[in-house]
């Protein structure tokens, strides 16, 4: 089941997934001046079985100026995945975050792709938040968001993170990015009663800190 919305945005913070659940789609977007090749894939899809997941399809971009449909060939994601592990001769990577069962790792880049990737996430996907450089974290809970299905509708949990300027004093030190876990923390899904939600808490805290909210623009 696809998530209806994008993960929430937090001022002065950025998020990303450490691994992508099977069923996730990534649009094949090209940067300005380039377009998808004719007959090229519209998206990449994370697929797999119980033991192995990978991205199906490959994205290819070509210059908008030329009518030439010569393919700018990039290897299939699986080829690149293997090449990565053989080329790296040092023990730089511990367990690959995306070796989680039922998950794909970050798709490989392709020539002339758009700067920002547009993902279509599925229920159960988790994304992790960090404050951008120059800001520090004030935490009241996990700095992550999970796409959940509640009563037939999807929603993202609200990450408990506020990012404040480096110079401002803080009693909460910033935290390192957590190791990726495939599922979110347990939450009661049985009741639909609305009391003080995590969103309300976050909003109340944020109101005193920062009034502007970033919005993502996709071009």
């Amino acid at each position: 089941e696809l998530c209806d919305d994008d993960p929430p945005e937090i001022p002065h913070a950025t998020f990303k997934a450490m691994a992508y659940k099977e069923g996730t789609m990534l649009n094949c977007e090209c940067k300005r001046g380039f377009r998808r090749i004719k007959s090229g894939s519209l998206y990449m899809l994370c697929t797999g079985n119980s033991s192995h997941s990978s991205w199906d399809n490959q994205c290819q971009c070509t210059s908008s100026a030329t009518r030439n449909t010569t393919k700018q060939v990039t290897p299939q994601p699986e080829e690149q995945k293997e090449r990565k592990t053989t080329e790296m001769q040092s023990p730089m990577q511990p367990v690959d975050q995306a070796s989680l069962p039922g998950h794909c790792r970050e798709p490989p880049p392709w020539e002339n792709e758009a700067t920002e990737r547009i993902y279509h996430f599925v229920v159960g996907q988790m994304v992790y938040y960090q404050c951008v450089q120059g800001y520090r974290a004030l935490h009241r809970g996990p700095a992550e968001s999970v796409c959940k299905m509640t009563h037939g509708k999807t929603r993202w949990t609200q990450p408990q993170l506020i990012c404040t300027g480096e110079m401002e004093t803080s009693q909460f030190p910033g935290e390192e990015k957590p190791q990726a876990s495939p599922e979110g923390r347990p939450e009661s899904e049985t009741s639909c009663l609305v009391t003080t939600t995590d969103f309300q808490i976050q909003t109340e805290m944020a109101a005193t800190m920062e009034t502007s909210i970033f919005t993502t623009e996709y071009q």
Epitope: E9, T14, F15, Q93, R117, Q130, V132, Q133, K177
Partner: nanobody, 130 residues
Framework: EVQLVESGGGLVQAGGSLRLSCAAS????????VGWFRQAPGKEPEGVSY????????YYIDSVKGRFTISSDNAKRTVYLQMNTLKPEDTAVYYC???????????????????????WGKGTLVTVSS
């Protein structure tokens, strides 16, 4: 095919300088943080520096601040690490690495960790003698 090729390593005396280069192919820097890790014999790798392809934000670990400078030539798809006032403790294999930016094309320095990189080069050895 995505490739990262480092060059510029070598033997230098303490106090000397080196300039490392990382030439990339198969992708453009726009959506990535590109930079350097180093690994000394018997030690854990550490993230030295990065620069974001989207807006050129730079990061350095404390031990190299004021001595190392990272820069990029996006047109040439090359990232440079100018290393001045080198010390024996800078001796290590230096690896070029790449990590995808987060939402809004932004990046967090705590993500610059060895276990989370998308691609690596093969490394170039820097030896600083006393």
């Amino acid at each position: 095919e995505v490739q990262l090729v480092e060059s510029g390593g070598g033997l230098v005396q303490a106090g000397g300088s080196l300039r490392l280069s990382c030439a990339a192919s198969g992708f453009t820097f726009d959506g990535y943080a590109v930079g350097w890790f180093r690994q000394a014999p018997g030690k854990e790798p550490e993230g030295v520096s990065y620069i974001t392809g989207s807006d050129g934000v730079t990061y350095y670990i404390d031990s190299v601040k004021g001595r190392f400078t990272i820069s990029s030539d996006n047109a040439k798809r090359t990232v440079y690490l100018q290393m001045n006032t080198l010390k024996p403790e800078d001796t290590a294999v230096y690896y070029c690495a790449v990590d995808r930016l987060g939402s809004q094309g932004r990046y967090a320095s705590s993500w610059w960790r060895a276990g989370d990189m998308d691609f690596w080069g093969k490394g170039t050895l820097v030896t600083v003698s006393s």
